[in-house]
Every structure is written in C-alpha cells, then in structure tokens.
Amino acid sequence: FEIALPRESNITVLIKLGTPTLLAKPCYIVISKRHITMLSIKSGERIVFTFSCQSPENHFVIEIQKNIDCMSGPCPFGEVQLQPSTSLLPTLNRTFIWDVKAHKSIGLELQFSIPRLRQIGPGESCPDGVTHSISGRIDATVVRIGTFCSNGTVSRIKMQEGVKMALHLPWFHPRNVSGFSIANRSSIKRLCIIESVFEGEGSATLMSANYPEGFPEDELMTWQFVVPAHLRASVSFLNFNLSNCERKEERVEYYIPGSTTNPEVFKLEDKQPGNMAGNFNLSLQGCDQDAQSPGILRLQFQVLVQHPQNESNKIYVVDLSNERAMSLTIEPRPVKQSRKFVPGCFVCLESRTCSSNLTLTSGSKHKISFLCDDLTRLWMNVEKTISCTDHRYCQRKSYSLQVPSDILHLPVELHDFSWKLLVPKDRLSLVLVPAQKLQQHTHEKPCNTSFSYLVASAIPSQDLYFGSFCPGGSIKQIQVKQNISVTLRTFAPSFQQEASRQGLTVSFIPYFKEEGVFTVTPDTKSKVYLRTPNWDRGLPSLTSVSWNISVPRDQVACLTFFKERSGVVCQTGRAFMIIQEQRTRAEEIFSLDEDVLPKPSFHHHSFWVNISNCSPTSGKQLDLLFSVTLTPRTVDLT
C-alpha cells in the first residue's frame, strides 16, 4: 500500500490496532522491514507499507483526520469530500474525521443529503455499520451532540465555535462520498440546533447533548421539527434527569409558528404536548448548577408523527335520572397557557352536539361520546346539593356522600365531586362520619392517598376552610355549625382502584354554636397531627373550634404544640385555649395572645382542646399545629 498526503492538506492518517480479537496470530504493519502496531502519516508524507497478515481488517482500523481552520482564513464550505479516496486506502474499518475550528460568532451547519440521520443511544449500533458521531465545542470542552445512523429524519445540525464530525465506515462498505456538506450561518446563540424532517408518518428518538452524561451547564439546545400540515406530532419523554439548580430553572420550551402563546414552557416532569399540527421547535434550557452537588440534566425523548386518530364511536351512558340537584361538567384540564395549535378535544352529547365543555344535569339519562386523541386532556367536576329546608323533617336524617358508579365508569378522570350541604340557619348543624377514619393533611404528615376530602364553609361571606382530609387517620367525625361544601378531590388515576375507600355519611343534628368539633380517636401506632382551620390565613375572627380527643384506659396521650407562642395579636377581644379533662372537668386556660403555649402535657383520660379567636390585627393571625401521641400507661396514677 502507498499513502501520499498532499502538503498543506491538513490531513493526518493513523492506522492502529482496533479492538483486540481472540485471533491466535498477531498482525503488524511492516514498514522498511520493521514491524509496528501503529502508523501515523502527516500532510506532505508519502509512505509505503504492507501488513504481515492476510486479513488486516480483523486487526487494524484507519482514521483519517482533516483539520479545517476557519479562524485564520476562509472556510472551505460546500460538499465535503472523502480524502484520500477510499479506493486508495487499505480495506480496514475507516473513520473519517473533520475537525472544524471557527470563531464563536460563526455558525456552522452540517447538511445531510438523503438518507437523513437517525440518532442512536448508548449501546446501540447501526445495522449497516455506518455511524456519524458529531460533537461541538464550548471553549476548550468537547460536547457530544450525538451518534447517528442512516435512514432517519435529521437533515441539518447547526453549531458554533467548531464542530467535529466522524464518519465511521466498515471495511466492506462501498461508500465513497461523505454524504454531507458544511455551510456557514450567523451565530445561533446556543449549543446547537438539530433539524428533523418528517415526510410522512414515523418517529424519531433524540437525546440531549452528552447523553447519557449530563447536558452542559446553563446551555440551550433546540430541535426544529418539520412536519407536514396534515399530520400530527406528539412528544413523549422516555428518560430524563434533573440537576440541582442554584439559579434559573431547567425547562423545555415549545415554539409553534403562528401560535399566539409562544414560547410554551414546560417542566421536564410535565406531560408534554401531543397532537400538534405542522412544524414546531423544542428547546432544552439548562440552569446554573450547584457547584457542590451539580447532579445531571439529561433528556431522551420521542417525537411520534401520525395521522389524526380515528375517533372511537363508543357511547357512554350517564344515568342521572335518579339524582337531584346535581350537575356534571366534563371540561379541559387547565393548561399553563392555551395552546391554540393543539387540535380540538371534544365531548359530544348524543354524538351530535360536540364542544370542549359539556355539563350534564340531574333528572335525565345522557348518552355521550368523545372526539379526542388523548382523554387525559379532560377531567370531570361534579356538584351535588343536599339541602334541608324543614328542620323537623331533616333532623337525624343521614345521606351517603358517594360518587355514583356511572360516573366512575367514564373514561375521563374525576377531578372534584362536591357536595353542598345546606341547613336552616340556627336550627340544625351537620356531622360528617367517614367509613374509614380520616387524617388531616399537614406539612408534617401529608396525605399520600389518591383522593382527599376538602371541607369548607359554604356560606358566601365566610372564608373558612376546615382542611383537607384523607382516609387512614384518627378523625372519627367532624361536626360543623352550618352550611359546608365537602369536595372529594382525586390526585391520581389510581382513584379508580381506591374508590371503595371513599365513603362519608352526613347527618343533620341539633344546632350547636361552635364552628367545628373534631372527634379524634388516636391509634397507638402513630402520631396524630391536627391544625386549626384556615391554616396560613388564620382562624377567622371570633371563631371557636374544638377537638374531642379520646384516650383509651391503658394509654396516656402526649399533647404537643409546635411553637412557643401562638403569634396572634388581638385588635379586640381575647384569644384563648382551654384544655379540659372530660372525666374530672378540670381545665387549664391559656391566653393565646399573651401566654406561651403549654409544654408537652400528658393526659390519662379523654380531654377537650378548645380554641377561640379574638379579632386579630391583620398579619398576626391565629394558626396552631399540635400533635397527639398515645403510649402505653406504665403506672396507674389514679
């Protein structure tokens, strides 16, 4: 073999051992009767050599690197040639490398002729063995843009400051053209832009730079998708990690030509948009990472382009004929901004009247169907009113607050089911008794069930939110003075499986003056956290609430408050707390606007905690959090 490299060609040829094989006999490059395992040929050199074996392709690889300097002179733009021609090279696995160095202000664009490129992930290989490895540069740091095979959608890659393109050809491959050209562009002001062109239906899997390692800190990378107008594109994230941000927030942004809401900003953990018509851009923006513990940002995603879905002809029956004072609304879930580019998602009544919102009322049987590619874009909100106008008729009457099975069988997620419970003023009150004891949601012990009950006053002038409650706690019942709304709110699709855990009975009971009374029967196993209504906004003025806390005979209860002082400042009146032993009626009274809150106290018998508010000055509200823990009694002190 003879390889002659023209002077000033800036080409270096390197023949070296490839990955070691288990072949018995080694092979050498023979030059001037010397046996070597590596041969480097520089511009202006002419070297004659042979191999010491019959099949050097099993032993050696050849790298041909051309350095293109766009810093000191004009750049040789246009179609890139394979130099030296593959016919002049020994038949080894070949890697042609083009290393282009340019100023930061210069954009470089690699244009790939058909077939376009398909990105592959770590551990994957190309069927024909032809791979394209592309990397960029940020100052002195090399950044891997990705490894690509033929027969894909990637048509152009734009970078700045420099690009390194490596084309790997197996020894048996007849290819004798590079398949790409280089053009200059204005600065792209980001790490890179990858253009992906879909001619018809198909999918593309793409990855952030350096994948599976971390995306460079505080960088921006953009993918431009060219999609025929009659097709729809959906994005799904296959794999992602977030780094630890010190400043800014990692995010993806969608830009849709013609949209009035550009850019659409999403967190990586959000559900990404689907059913987009026409072209769109997706950008990944990094953040300033924590120097001590940066973590890594990485993203692997898929774009699926297909014809709009053939909508299901399935009819769903919603029978509300036996219901009273109830309305069911199917509507789009709120999105951060309305995305006008997303095709409509409709719900139809009797398959004729279709709209994005539909409200069904009680007293009838309804037939509905859906014209929507993704039913998770919709949810249901239901309101039902249970009212008592005649206190003589209602007293002691009970109603079950349960989601009807017809509603649970719909293919749309239930968001809220609200019961408005109305009583005659100053005549009756309400008691809520759950099928399973409830836990109050607190920061210290959050609910992690698929649904919760939100209990709030339903009197328009009163801003009183009792709290969020979920099954699996110690609250046996909640008594409230007057009108309330109880909302069953779902937090996960698994509510369908957990629906059997719901179950709340409301009864009308004789009127009492306190705003609310919670009956608590703690379990010996866990700490019960309780907090005053209207947490964060403060207990309303002149409002009184009580907790009736049961202590079993063989247990002792520890009552603990979570701050030293209540923090309330009274404008008028006094705020106080009474802790009263139910057996002896012995009580302790604490002035909440003056005294420190009591230290942890032990109670051997059931007791009351009553908190009554004054009219506080603004900003100095009454918020109390306390816990009750049962432990076995060691000594009987009675």
Partner: antibody, heavy 117, light 111 residues
Framework: EVQLQESGAELARPGASVKLSCKAS????????MQWVKQRPGQGLEWIGA????????RYTQKFKGKATLTADKSSSTAYMQLSSLASEDSAVYYC??????????WGQGTLVTVSS | NIVLTQSPASLAVSLGQRATISCRAS??????????MHWYQQKPGQPPKLLIY???NLESGVPARFSGSGSRTDFTLTIDPVEADDAATYYC?????????FGGGTKLEIK
Amino acid sequence: EVQLQESGAELARPGASVKLSCKASGYTFTSYWMQWVKQRPGQGLEWIGAIYPGDGDTRYTQKFKGKATLTADKSSSTAYMQLSSLASEDSAVYYCAGYDAPWFAYWGQGTLVTVSS
Amino acid sequence: NIVLTQSPASLAVSLGQRATISCRASESVDSYGNSFMHWYQQKPGQPPKLLIYLASNLESGVPARFSGSGSRTDFTLTIDPVEADDAATYYCQQNNEDPWTFGGGTKLEIK
C-alpha cells in the same frame, strides 16, 4: 516453539577467522531481521549488525564493517557471522537474536569466542 | 549514530518499592507515530530477555509490574513493585536509525 541454536564455543589464534552459525526454527526466518550482538565479560551489549534473510539486506555498525560479515541461508534457515582478523579484544560472547514481530524476543544461548595465541 | 545514555548506572531498591530507569537518546527515535525504543533484562550467564517493545508495549509473558513510557528522546522503564527476582542489568535499544544502538545498561540491586 521458536528456537535459535548457536554453534559451539570457538578458540582461535590472533589474525584467524571464525564463522558462527545460528539456526532458526518455529517462525518465518525470511520475514524478520536477525541481529548479532557482542558482549565482553562484565561489559554491556554492543550491536554488531543485522541481516534481513528475505533479501539479504545487511546493516552494520561502523566499528564492525570489515570485521564482521553477515550472511543467511534461506534453505536451512540459518544465519552466519564471520569474524575475521581476530584480535584479543574480539574475545567475547556473541549472540544472535531473532523475532516473529515486533521485536527481538528470541535470543540464542550465545557463542563464546576466545582469541589466544 | 544515536547515542543512548542510561541513568543511573546502578541503583539499589528495597523490595516492594518502585525502580525507575531512564534512557536518553541523542536524537529522536520516533517515526510514523512510533517510538522505536525497546527494553531488555539480562541476568548473569543468560542472554537478554525482551521486556518492552516500541517504548510502552509489554512483551507477552512479562509481568505487569514492568512498564515503559516516553517518546522522542526521553524514555523510562518502571518496575513497581520490585521483587527479588528483578535483580539484573537492564538495557535500552533503539532501531529508528542505523546503526541500531544499545544503552550502557543499569544494574538493579535489591536491598
């Protein structure tokens, strides 16, 4: 298994000549250099020269041009070194060394040449 | 001629410690991307034994305690950790240019 078998010890008079042999086996004799190295007692290694049996190409260090003549017989896979005009300073152990790439991994056991009147 | 200067001429190293031998060439022994420098071990009464070829490649059967490094004019043989059996004289040889030449040798003694 590769072997280089050198001829036995030689006792020669000053001014005489000796021809040392080195028979190779276990590798392709014609494809690799055979080098010859001199080592005087308690001294270091001194390169004499090398021959490429495939085409008879020879290389010598200046000091041994005219003193040593390297030849090879392809048919018997044997390399020879003739030392002429022997003097007492030619008394030494002479090694042949060969290889099957990439370098001289195989050495003969050495031939002791003693020049004495 | 390319002159190879080995240093030190002799050295004593404790068992388990590292031994480093240097070989400096009067001009570069690199070409075609290779360093044509090789290392041998010789024990009394025996022919030399190849340890390292082309500056850094370990000959088959030689323990990984031996390593070679360097390029152009400066080369190093390292033995780490040294064992009792390593007591010998070590030589470098170049074949980049005719005549091929040897270094003067370094005698390694184990303490």
